[in-house]
């Protein structure tokens, strides 16, 4: 599920407040009715919108996957913020999954950066100080590098 999935709302529930659009747009936390005459509030914890918009449906809240922790819940104006669990990280070029951080550096290298939710440990060559891309674990280590569970995109929209 991505934050861009539609959250269908065929009928307006009693708790969903209506107001009039301004300049044809509805405020954050709302979507517009099909005829463009009403702004309908998103449902807290279920869907959201972050900007003034004319979306026909609010955007479905992201659910954090196993392997992720929820930093902040979904509100009507902001998507859920999920973060990889301790010991795992999510790379920018593969945001769909949390991967396990390596437990150590290859032989001849030293650790200069810790595992964070956004990056693997950072290793540099002892002599030259050049960074290592991080694919090959040390020969004597048995570092598991199997990918974690796929993770939903978090709070960014658009």
């Amino acid at each position: 599920i991505t934050q861009q999935d539609l959250a269908p709302q065929q009928r307006v529930a009693p708790q969903q407040k209506r107001s009039s659009p301004s300049e044809g747009l509805c405020p954050p936390g709302h979507h517009i009715s099909e005829d463009g005459r009403d702004c309908i509030s998103c449902k807290y914890g279920q869907d959201y919108s972050t900007h003034w918009n004319d979306l026909l449906f609010c955007l479905r809240c992201t659910r954090c996957d196993s392997g992720e922790v929820e930093l902040s819940p979904c509100t009507t104006t902001r998507n859920t913020v999920c973060q990889c669990e301790e010991g795992t990280f999510r790379e920018e070029d593969s945001p769909e999954m949390c991967r396990k951080c390596r437990t150590g550096c290859p032989r001849g290298m030293v650790k200069v950066g810790d595992c964070t939710p956004w990056s693997d440990i950072e290793c540099v060559h002892k002599e030259s100080g050049t960074k290592h891309s991080g694919e090959a674990p040390a020969v004597e280590e048995t570092v598991t590098s199997s990918p974690g569970t796929p993770a939903s995109p978090c709070s960014l929209s658009g």
Epitope: G24, G36, L56, L59, G158
Partner: nanobody, 126 residues
Framework: EVQLLESGGGLVQPGGSLRLSCAAS????????VGWFRQAPGKGREFVSA????????YYADSVKGRFTISRDNSKNTVYLQMNSLRPEDTAVYYC???????????????????WGQGTLVTVSS
């Protein structure tokens, strides 16, 4: 899920014309307004034009006013961008967008969008 499919890009000489199409596959564009953005090589994404599918109200960036015309055919679930008097500086990847996002209600220029097409390349060169 909202999917936007652009077509009509290509190579054209300065002063020439092209018509881009944006079709919503599936049931909906997901919003009332549909727009076009463009991204020139090495530059950020820039708003070009938008149209309100309900009443046909149109919006244009100053750089394309008088040269580009946006229109819609609701029966075909398609939005068009007619580009005339093309200039080399119009060279860019053109993206169809829906669910346009604005910082304020009175803003005429959206800051982004929820739904994006894959883009179609327009090259203006002699």
């Amino acid at each position: 899920e909202v999917q936007l499919l652009e077509s009509g890009g290509g190579l054209v000489q300065p002063g020439g014309s092209l018509r881009l199409s944006c079709a919503a596959s599936g049931r909906t564009f997901g919003s009332i307004r549909v727009g076009w953005f463009r991204q020139a090589p090495g530059k950020g994404r820039e708003f070009v034009s938008a149209i309100n599918r309900n009443d046909g109200t149109t919006y244009y960036a100053d750089s394309v006013k008088g040269r580009f015309t946006i229109s819609r055919d609701n029966s075909k679930n398609t939005v068009y961008l007619q580009m005339n008097s093309l200039r080399p500086e119009d060279t860019a990847v053109y993206y169809c967008a829906a669910g346009l996002q604005y910082n304020r209600a009175a803003d005429r220029v959206p800051v982004g969008a929820v739904y994006w097409g894959q883009g179609t390349l327009v090259t203006v060169s002699s």
